[in-house]
């Protein structure tokens, strides 16, 4: 691994999907068709594209990205409605920088409420809070300029789960590209 950790192998916590089949690996099946489909990736905690062969496979397969998100991402519909309804900046944008406890080395971005800008920080890979983004773009879309332009900025964000760490759930809201298993 490079110094910038691959998130499939980090000290980062995971969140439980809504259904057990959401935890299944993408299975293209034995057939040879090439059908664009979507699956929920347990490691990146988001819905991603994969190519389905057209037969067999498993239940972690959806025709649309939206269907995948609705089925497997906790709180998705609630946050999607909130995002669509206006430019409300989520509360977690105001949380202080928290690199967590661990010694991973992940280049991340957070919204700085003092400067009103997204800035870089190093995340250790476990615990921490939800003011933690993989890309500058994602941070800007959700915290700097919510509701501006694309409209669905919050769609891939999880509702915080109630756990004993101070700031709610682990900050794993990723925007990875195709991650075929």
């Amino acid at each position: 691994l490079s110094e910038e950790a691959d998130d499939t192998d980090s000290e980062l916590g995971s969140m439980k999907p809504l259904h057990t089949f959401c935890a299944m690996k993408a299975d293209d099946g034995p057939c040879k068709a090439m059908i664009r489909s979507y699956f929920f990736n347990m490691y990146t905690h988001q819905c991603e594209e994969f190519i389905y062969g057209g037969c067999e496979g498993n239940e972690n397969r959806f025709d649309t990205l939206e269907e995948c998100k609705k089925t497997c991402i906790p709180g998705y519909e609630k946050t999607a409605v909130k995002a669509a309804s206006g430019a409300e900046r989520p509360d977690f944008c105001f949380l202080e920088e928290d690199p967590g406890l661990c010694r991973g080395y992940m280049k991340r971005y957070l919204y700085n409420n003092q400067t009103k800008q997204c800035e870089r920080f190093v995340y250790g890979g476990c615990l921490g809070n939800r003011n933690n983004f993989e890309t500058l773009d994602e941070c800007k879309k959700i915290c700097e300029n919510p509701g501006g332009g694309s409209g669905g900025g919050l769609n891939d964000i999880f509702e915080a789960q109630k756990i004993e760490w101070h700031e709610g759930g682990p900050p794993h809201h990723h925007h990875h590209h195709h991650h075929h298993h």
Epitope: L1, A5, T8, D9, S10, E11, L12, G13, S14, Y43, L95, E96, E97, D98, P99, G100, L101, C102, R103, G104, Y105, V122, G124, G125, C126, L127, G128, N129, I163, E164, W165, H166, E167
Partner: antibody, heavy 116, light 111 residues
Framework: EVQLVESGGGLVQPGRSLRLSCAVS????????MQWVRQAPGKGLEWVSG????????GYADSVKGRFTISRDNAKNSLYLQMNSLRAEDTALYYC?????????WGQGTLVTVSS | QSVLTQPPSASGTPGQRVTISCSGS????????VHWYQQLPGTAPKLLIY???HRPSGVPDRFSGSKSGTSASLAISGLRSEDEADYYC???????????FGTGTKVTVLG
Amino acid sequence: EVQLVESGGGLVQPGRSLRLSCAVSGLTIDNYAMQWVRQAPGKGLEWVSGISGNSRSIGYADSVKGRFTISRDNAKNSLYLQMNSLRAEDTALYYCAIFLHESDYWGQGTLVTVSS
Amino acid sequence: QSVLTQPPSASGTPGQRVTISCSGSTSNIGTMYVHWYQQLPGTAPKLLIYRNNHRPSGVPDRFSGSKSGTSASLAISGLRSEDEADYYCLAWDDTLRAYVFGTGTKVTVLG
């Protein structure tokens, strides 16, 4: 040179409390997560608790959850462990440690003995 | 009892290669980094390998780390008498939300 010095250990009766301290010199701790790790006599290492630089992330081993409280005072460059309702099985050498991205700093430990 | 399992002991003669395993699960080694420590008798642990396979400065390249699936390994090549110590793996466990050390392996240099 970075030095971590633990103190506060000693002999204590079951059910009583003890507060451990770890004073750090040669490094400003503000930006670093800190840990407590213990080792019972003749046994292996056990992570006890950890706290992020700004105290916003805190974790505990199941064996101490609800009894031990970790805290830090960055102005004093110090880490603390408040240990309540102590049990015989908490008897150990308690190390304070800083896990950096690519290195570690450890103290030499302070011995806690819980016995009646 | 630890969720990371190591063999209690390992041994070899000077110059030999010794490998120590650390077996866990998807909630720790399977998705998290593994770090390795050496503890010489009567001293504090020393970081030997961090993030699966990186060596801190000052650690000889005789020590190497690797990871596959839910297991990790520490290899010591060209074993020397000063390598006689206890070795521990460490990983964050996502289910426990805690760091967990392995059970520890005592390495003995024979002869």
